[in-house]
């Protein structure tokens, strides 16, 4: 996590729609060869729901060995259980795989809560569901964990998709997406669809149900609707972004842009909720209360602790205000905001013993790491990962959860100044000053 | 103040029954979510049964359901938990909870500790083999 001193804010102006729709650098543009259609082969890919993770089969080793592997793009470790754990139906074995070498160093990575620690080696890799490829890549093969694995979650590993940057344990290991697009002719881009389903799934349903679509090196048209929208990635590390204004049911929260992107914004699969800044959750949390106000909530569901429930199909959505996040344009002070709907951050929970109440947890929380847009609001939208071009796109998905009155949107363009200001610089730490 | 006061718990053979009372007191009971609770040693306290009030809607826990049955009866200010078919495993302190309605639509979820504002002091039941 980065810790850095508060800088004096600078608010950025806000978004006032442009009568005139300025360029799109999306259908517009001629593509690379092979970057946009239909990867039909890798269509519905994906398995598993916001609260325990995506995941994507892959095969490890020689001969192959098949794994359930979490699609994270906010770390950049391809890590995998190797040892029994009681949460793991299957794990792999290195002793088994004729291709297995050993790198002769460790790797620990503790979070918040939990850790898992392994040893470093490399392997043959593919994607069953995926370009047909196999890639050597980086395996971390995780030999001890605490709080990592997921009881009934159905994954035995992790798959990070983000830059070498934050690699453990350095950013000299090279993380499995590099060596895919440096090994392999796939274009170094991919896209992710999160379906959530809108409704609890015991194990069961999850296993026989969809989960969304990871298409690896390109861009699928059935998978979303109306344009795709792209904001830069900031910094190549997390996939990090800028946000320059939030809005509740249109209202603006008014906030110093710079405090949305505190310390950082980053899209991340593999965390559940939407993830805001202390001082703007309290600001969100304050007008989607008075926006639902019809309705007294106990401060426990707002803090995520305690559900709340309504008989069956009764759920009323329309009380529920809709949060847009306006996101830094592609070209100079202009902007387009994605909003979601309650249908996206109420998360459906299955309570206990009963089928006959649709139980929900507020999905979103507070962060003192900054922005974390989770699974929470890729469930809404089709997300392509470009990182040939260094950008983030967000289209409408083609299966997110809304009603027949409201629908997630991403719309623009809108006129906003001044929005470099909004990212927040974190504090480099000087090396030498430590020496003393 | 509101006051919960159960009964009715006792000693049992497995296959027979007891049914547990529960008086409310101290406050207007119509409308009210009730519940019952139990606690094994050294376990934690789990939501067995569960009434709305007003609406007579119930719910139970999978490991009763069909053996056990809430029900309320409005001019006793009293709940009831009917327990047939008793099993060893259902030894414990039964514990009767209330709360007020939260004046919504929505309702908290009924089987959870959470949800409920106010407790009896508990009544055991022993289930012998």
């Known amino acids: 996590t980065q810790h850095g001193i508060r800088l004096p804010l600078r608010s950025g102006l806000g978004g006032a729609p442009l009568g005139l729709r300025l360029p799109r650098e999306t259908d517009e543009e001629p593509e690379e060869p092979g970057r946009r259609g239909s990867f039909v082969e890798m269509v519905d890919n994906l398995r598993g729901k916001s609260g325990q993770g995506y995941y994507v089969e892959m095969t490890v080793g020689s001969p192959p060995q098949t794994l359930n592997i979490l699609v994270d793009t906010g770390s950049s470790n391809f890590a995998v259980g190797a040892a029994p754990h009681p949460f793991l139906h299957r794990y792999y074995q290195r002793q088994l795989s004729s291709t297995y070498r050993d790198l002769r160093k460790g790797v620990y990575v503790p979070y918040t809560q939990g850790k898992w620690e392994g040893e470093l080696g490399t392997d043959l890799v593919s994607i069953p569901h995926g370009p047909n490829v196999t890639v050597r890549a980086n395996i971390a093969a995780i030999t001890e964990s605490d709080k990592f694995f997921i009881n009934g979650s159905n994954w035995e590993g992790i798959l990070g998709l983000a830059y070498a940057e934050i690699a453990r344990p350095d950013d000299s290991l090279e993380p499995f997406f590099d060596s895919l697009v440096k090994q392999t002719h796939v274009p170094n881009l991919f896209s992710l669809q999160l379906c959530g389903a809108g409704f609890p799934l015991n194990q069961s349903e999850v296993l026989a149900s969809v989960g969304g679509s990871m298409i690896i090196g390109g861009i699928d048209h059935s998978l979303y609707t109306g344009s795709l929208w792209y904001t830069p990635i900031r910094r190549e590390w997390y996939y990090e972004v800028i946000i320059v204004r939030v809005e509740i049911n249109g209202q603006d929260l008014k906030m110093d842009c710079k405090e949305y992107n505190y310390d950082k914004s980053i899209v991340d699969s593999g965390t559940t909720n939407l993830r805001l800044p202390k001082k703007v959750f309290e600001a969100a949390v304050k007008s989607i209360k008075a926006a639902s106000s019809t309705e007294k909530f106990p401060d426990g569901f707002w803090l995520g602790e305690q559900l709340v429930c309504w008989q069956a199909g009764t759920t009323p959505w329309n009380i529920f205000p809709v949060i847009s996040l306006y996101l830094m344009g592609e070209v100079t002070n202009q902007s387009f905001r994605i909003t979601i709907l309650p249908q996206q951050y109420l998360r459906p929970v299955e309570d206990v013993a009963t089928s006959q109440d649709d139980c929900y947890k507020f999905a979103i929380s507070q962060s003192s790491t900054g922005t974390v847009m989770g699974a929470v609001i890729m469930e809404g939208f089709y997300v392509v990962f470009d990182r040939a071009r260094k950008r983030i796109g967000f289209a409408v998905s083609a299966c997110h959860v809304h009603d027949e009155f409201r629908t997630a949107a991403v719309e623009g363009p809108f006129v906003t100044l001044d929005m470099e200001d909004c990212g927040y610089n974190i504090p480099q730490t000087d090396e030498s000053t430590l020496m003393t | 103040d509101v006051q919960l006061q159960e009964s009715g718990g006792g000693s049992a053979q497995a296959g027979g029954s007891l049914r547990l009372s529960c008086e409310v007191s101290?406050?207007?009971?119509?409308?009210?979510?009730m519940g019952w609770f139990r606690q094994a040693p050294g376990e934690e306290r789990e939501g067995v049964a569960a009434?709305?009030?007003?609406?007579?809607?119930?719910w139970y826990a999978d490991s009763v359901k069909g053996r056990f049955t809430i029900s309320h009866d409005n001019a006793e200010s009293t709940v009831y938990l009917q327990m047939n078919s008793l099993q060893p495993e259902d030894t414990a302190i039964y514990f009767c909870?209330?709360?007020?309605?939260?004046?919504?639509?929505?309702?908290?979820?009924?089987?959870?500790?959470?949800?409920?504002?106010?407790w009896g002091q508990g009544t055991q039941v022993t289930v012998s083999s």
């Open positions: 101290g406050y207007t009971y119509s409308g009210y979510f």
């Open positions: 009434i709305d009030t007003n609406g007579g809607r119930t």
């Open positions: 909870a209330a709360r007020r309605p939260p004046g919504g639509s929505w309702y908290p979820p009924p089987l959870r500790k959470y949800s409920y504002n106010f």
